[in-house]
Interface confidence: low
């Protein structure tokens, strides 16, 4: 059972403090570092032995509305030969984020805060071997 | 979540825009609580790029533990165990969003904040560049 | 999956002793807050005590100076220590942690999860 709470209680609540209605938060979502742009060397995603293809995942319901995800290209590996090598694998590499979901019931509108699982690239793996008996 | 009332009538234009603030839920929703993979990964330390993972806390941030990876060596590892000189590891950086207590200290008052994480690394062709 | 499994409920006298432990098991690579919340009939979920992974401490006011948390990281394991008990320190107790781990290649960083309880009666 898995239940994600946001505020622990023994945080020591100071005067200043904005009241809160009982099992909310409030949530400013002007972002901090806005602007701050992400340095990765130049088309990894492309020079990788594990490349990947990015999709871009878009929900009006959803802050940021849109989501990158990325999908490796290959099950196994590019070689120095430029060859798919299936001796080796592909495989996600993951992280979590969190997203702000907009819920219509009825004529009243909702905010709940959600995770959401991101593949961010892949990277090449030495397979796992199961040997069977 | 914690519901507003939208004003009578009940347009059904929809809002383009998030409002500036908001009040949500304490619990967090999380569409991926539902796959229960069969077994662990090591995809760090099996990975021809691999990465030790840095843990940054933060107990003014949700969440207050965030593990950033950096990659063991400049070359990738080869078939035969060794590093590669002629390859490159290279961080995958992502841009999180992440809840940032705002005052500080305030149990149940947060702001989103952008923060940029490396997740693992990824080995690479490197760029060569020729000097004429 | 992480489980986390709580022993040492039980039927205690008013003034008495009681030492609760938790352990959590599964592919876990850091445990960064392990704690107790308690339950009691009718009443809300409520913090009893937490402790970080550097060592340090938070409890709840009503508990202070009377429960101890401590934890051995070696086994992913929590203890609280509950020292003249009250019969108000009757209720189910929780063990909580927030645990970063791998699972099918995927790292979860600070996921929050639950023990399904231990009673605690403070009854003469």
């Known amino acids: 059972r898995k239940i994600p709470k946001v505020g622990h209680t023994f945080f020591q609540k100071p005067e200043s403090c904005p009241p809160v209605p009982g099992g909310s938060m409030k949530l400013d979502i002007g972002i901090i570092n806005e602007n701050q742009r992400v340095s990765m060397s130049r088309n990894i995603e492309s020079r990788s032995t594990s490349p990947w293809n990015y999709t871009v995942t878009w929900d009006p319901n959803r802050y940021p509305s849109e989501v990158v995800q990325a999908q490796c290209r290959n099950l196994g590996c590019i070689n120095a030969q430029g060859k798919e090598d299936i001796s080796m694998n592909s495989v996600p590499i993951q992280q979590e984020t969190l997203v702000v979901r907009r819920k219509h019931q009825g004529c009243s509108v909702s905010f709940q805060l959600e995770k959401v699982l991101v593949t961010v690239g892949c990277t090449c793996v030495t397979p796992v071997i199961h040997h069977v008996q | 979540g914690i519901t507003i009332p939208r004003n009578p009538g009940c347009p059904n234009s929809e809002d383009k825009n998030f409002p500036r603030t908001v009040m949500v839920n304490l619990n967090i929703h999380n569409r991926n609580t539902n796959t229960n993979p069969k077994r662990s990964s090591d995809y760090y330390n099996r990975s021809t790029s691999p990465w030790n993972l840095h843990r940054n806390e933060d107990p003014e941030r949700y969440p207050s533990v965030i593990w950033e990876a950096k990659c063991r060596h400049l070359g990738c590892i080869n078939a035969d165990g060794n590093v590669d000189y002629h390859m490159n590891s290279v961080p995958i950086q992502q841009e999180i969003l992440v809840l940032r207590r705002e005052p500080p200290h305030c149990p149940n008052s947060f702001r989103l904040e952008k923060i940029l994480v490396s997740v693992g690394c990824t080995c690479v062709t490197p760029i060569v560049h020729h000097v004429a | 999956e992480v489980q986390l499994v709580e022993s040492g409920g039980g039927l205690v006298q008013p003034g008495g002793s009681q030492r609760l432990s938790c352990t959590a098991s599964g592919t876990i690579v850091n445990i960064h807050v392990m704690g107790w919340y308690r339950q009691a009939p009718g009443k809300q979920r409520e913090l009893v005590a937490l402790?970080?992974?550097?060592?340090?401490?938070d409890y709840a006011d009503s508990v202070k100076g009377r429960f101890t948390i401590s934890r051995d990281n070696s086994k992913n394991t929590v203890y609280l220590q509950m020292n003249s008990l009250r019969p108000e320190d009757t209720a189910v107790y929780y063990c909580?942690?927030?645990?970063?781990?791998?699972?099918?290649?995927?790292?979860?960083?600070?996921?929050?999860?639950w023990g399904q309880g231990t009673l605690v009666t403070v009854s003469s």
């Open positions: 402790i970080f992974s550097g060592g340090s401490a």
């Open positions: 909580a942690a927030e645990i970063g781990y791998y699972s099918g290649g995927t790292y979860y960083s600070s996921e929050a999860h």
